[in-house]
C-alpha cells in the first residue's frame, strides 16, 4: 500500500445499540480512496479470538473470522469506495455487546476507531383504554424489553404527580427466555387528559401517549436509543 505506514487517516464511529433477534448496524466512516482494491476494512471485537469481519481487494476475506460471527456479518460493498465501512450484523445476540474496533487501511494511510455496542430489547409501547376494568383504566403494553426497564406514568393535567400508588406494572418472560413483555395498568383515569407511559432501560427510552376526551382517543408512540450519538 505504498505510503500507508507513514500517514494516519480519520476513521469515525458512532456508539449504537442492537435489538436482540433483529439486524443491527455498527457505523464507521473513513476518508475515501479512489481505488477499491487499495482499501482494507477490519472489524475486531475486544476479547474475541478471531476477526469479526474483513473486507479487502473489493471482497470479503473471512478465513480468520471468529465462529460467533460466522454468516452474520456484511459490509455495504457498494459504499466502501465512498468511505462507508459500516458493518451489518444479522440476528443480534445479547453477547454481541462490547467494544468494537473499525480498522482501515488505504493508499493514503491507516486509522482506527472504537465503538461501544450495547445490546438489549426495546419496543414501542401501546396505550389503550381498558374497558373491562371496573373503573376508568389505561393499559400500557410493550412486547419486548431487556434488561428489565422501569415504567413511569405521567399526565399533562397533573404534572409532577406520582402515579406509582395507582398503577401496577408486571413483566412477563417471553418464550425465548430473555426478553420480557411489559404491561402497566393505570387506575382512576380522568377524561380530558393526556397520559404518558414511559418505559426506560439503559439502552432505550420509549413513550406511549394517549389523549382521552369524551369524543375521541388519540395515541402517539416514540422510541429513543440512549447513549448513541446518532
Amino acid at each position: 500500500f505504498g505510503i500507508s505506514g507513514r500517514h494516519s487517516i480519520t476513521v469515525t464511529t458512532v456508539a449504537s445499540a442492537g435489538n436482540i433477534g433483529e439486524d443491527g448496524i455498527l457505523s464507521c466512516t473513513f476518508e475515501p480512496d479512489i481505488k477499491l482494491s487499495d482499501i482494507v476494512i477490519q472489524w475486531l471485537k475486544e476479547g474475541v479470538l478471531g476477526l469479526v469481519h474483513e473486507f479487502k481487494e473489493g471482497k470479503d476475506e473471512l478465513s480468520e473470522q471468529d465462529e460467533m460471527f460466522r454468516g452474520r456479518t456484511a459490509v455495504f460493498a457498494d459504499q466502501v469506495i465512498v468511505g462507508n465501512a459500516s458493518l451489518r450484523l444479522k440476528n443480534v445476540q445479547l453477547t454481541d455487546a462490547g467494544t468494537y474496533k473499525c480498522y482501515i487501511i488505504t493508499s493514503k494511510g491507516k486509522g482506527n476507531a472504537n465503538l461501544e455496542y450495547k445490546t438489549g430489547a426495546f419496543s414501542m409501547p401501546e396505550v389503550n383504554v381498558d374497558y373491562n376494568a371496573s373503573s376508568e383504566t389505561l393499559r400500557c403494553e410493550a412486547p419486548r424489553w431487556f434488561p428489565q426497564p422501569t415504567v413511569v406514568w405521567a399526565s399533562q393535567v397533573d404534572q409532577g404527580a406520582n402515579f406509582s400508588e395507582v398503577s401496577n406494572t408486571s413483566f412477563e418472560l417471553n418464550s425465548e427466555n430473555v426478553t420480557m413483555k411489559v404491561v402497566s395498568v393505570l387506575y382512576n383515569v380522568t377524561i380530558n387528559n393526556t397520559y404518558s407511559c414511559m418505559i426506560e432501560n439503559d439502552i432505550a427510552k420509549a413513550t406511549g401517549d394517549i389523549k382521552v376526551t369524551e369524543s375521541e382517543i388519540k395515541r402517539r408512540s416514540h422510541l429513543q436509543l440512549l447513549n448513541s450519538k446518532a
Epitope: Q42, G47, V48, D66, L94
Partner: antibody, heavy 122, light 107 residues
Framework: EVQLLESGGGLVQPGGSLRLSCAAS????????MSWVRQAPGKGLEWVSA????????YYADSVKGRFTISRDNSKNTLYLQMNSLRAEDTAVYYC???????????????WGQGTLVTVSS | DIQMTQSPSSLSASVGDRVTITCRAS??????LAWYQQKPGKAPKLLIY???SLEGGVPSRFSGSGSGTDFTLTISSLQPEDFATYYC?????????FGQGTKVEIK
C-alpha cells in the same frame, strides 16, 4: 500487578468430575479472552480451551470437546473449567493464561497462573 | 487442526553460542506465532509474539523470524539463565496449538 491464581485441582477417579477456578486481578478482566493450558508430567504444553472476553464464544481442543466446559464470571473476575468424564490422560498441571485483547494486534498468554495439579487415578 | 513441529527436540550448547530453533506449521498461519520459555516447575514465559515482536522485558538476544509455515527463534549469545525448554505456539484465528518443545541443555 496482574495476577492469576488457580484452584480446584486434586485427585479424582476416572469418570469423575472436577471444577477448576482461576481468580484474576490487576487488569480489566472482561476485556481479555482467557485460556486454559495443561501440561502432563514430563510432557509438553497443550492448549485446552479458551473463552472470549464477554463469554459469548468458547473454543476447545479436540481432546476435551464434549467433556470440558469453560465459563467465566466477569462480575467476580473468575474463569472456570468444568471437567467431566475425566480420563487418566487428563492428568496434568492446569494453567490459566491471559489470552488476547484484540485479534492480531496484542500479545497473548503474557500472564500465567502458577498451575493446579489434576490427578485422575483409581 | 493445525500441527506445529519443532526441531530439534533437544540440543546441547555452551554459554555464548548462537542457538537456532525452528518451528513448522502444517498450514499457513501468517505471522500468528509466539515463542515461550519454560523452566522446570515454573509457568511458561512469553518471549516473542506475532513471529518477531519482542515481549516487553525480554532481552534483545532473543529474536524471532518467519511467516506462513516456517519460523525461527534465535538466541544470539546463550546465557546461563537461558537453559530451559522452548515452545512455539500458533494462534491462527480461534485455535491455539503448541509445538512439542525444544530442550536447551548445557554442553
Amino acid at each position: 500487578e496482574v495476577q492469576l491464581l488457580e484452584s480446584g485441582g486434586g485427585l479424582v477417579q476416572p469418570g469423575g468430575s472436577l471444577r477448576l477456578s482461576c481468580a484474576a486481578s490487576g487488569f480489566t478482566f472482561s476485556s481479555y479472552a482467557m485460556s486454559w493450558v495443561r501440561q502432563a508430567p514430563g510432557k509438553g504444553l497443550e492448549w485446552v480451551s479458551a473463552i472470549s472476553g464477554g463469554g459469548g464464544s468458547t473454543y476447545y481442543a479436540d481432546s476435551v470437546k464434549g467433556r470440558f466446559t469453560i465459563s467465566r464470571d466477569n462480575s467476580k473476575n473468575t474463569l472456570y473449567l468444568q471437567m467431566n468424564s475425566l480420563r487418566a490422560e487428563d492428568t496434568a498441571v492446569y494453567y490459566c493464561a491471559r489470552d488476547i485483547q484484540w485479534f492480531g494486534e496484542s500479545t497473548l498468554f503474557d500472564y500465567w497462573g502458577q498451575g493446579t495439579l489434576v490427578t485422575v487415578s483409581s | 487442526d493445525i500441527q506445529m513441529t519443532q526441531s530439534p527436540s533437544s540440543l546441547s550448547a555452551s554459554v555464548g553460542d548462537r542457538v537456532t530453533i525452528t518451528c513448522r506449521a502444517s498450514q499457513s498461519i501468517r505471522s500468528w506465532l509466539a515463542w515461550y520459555q519454560q523452566k522446570p516447575g515454573k509457568a511458561p514465559k512469553l518471549l516473542i509474539y506475532k513471529a518477531s515482536s519482542l515481549e516487553g522485558g525480554v532481552p534483545s538476544r532473543f529474536s524471532g523470524s518467519g511467516s506462513g509455515t516456517d519460523f525461527t527463534l534465535t538466541i544470539s549469545s546463550l546465557q546461563p539463565e537461558d537453559f530451559a525448554t522452548y515452545y512455539c505456539q500458533q494462534y491462527n484465528s480461534y485455535s491455539r496449538t503448541f509445538g512439542q518443545g525444544t530442550k536447551v541443555e548445557i554442553k
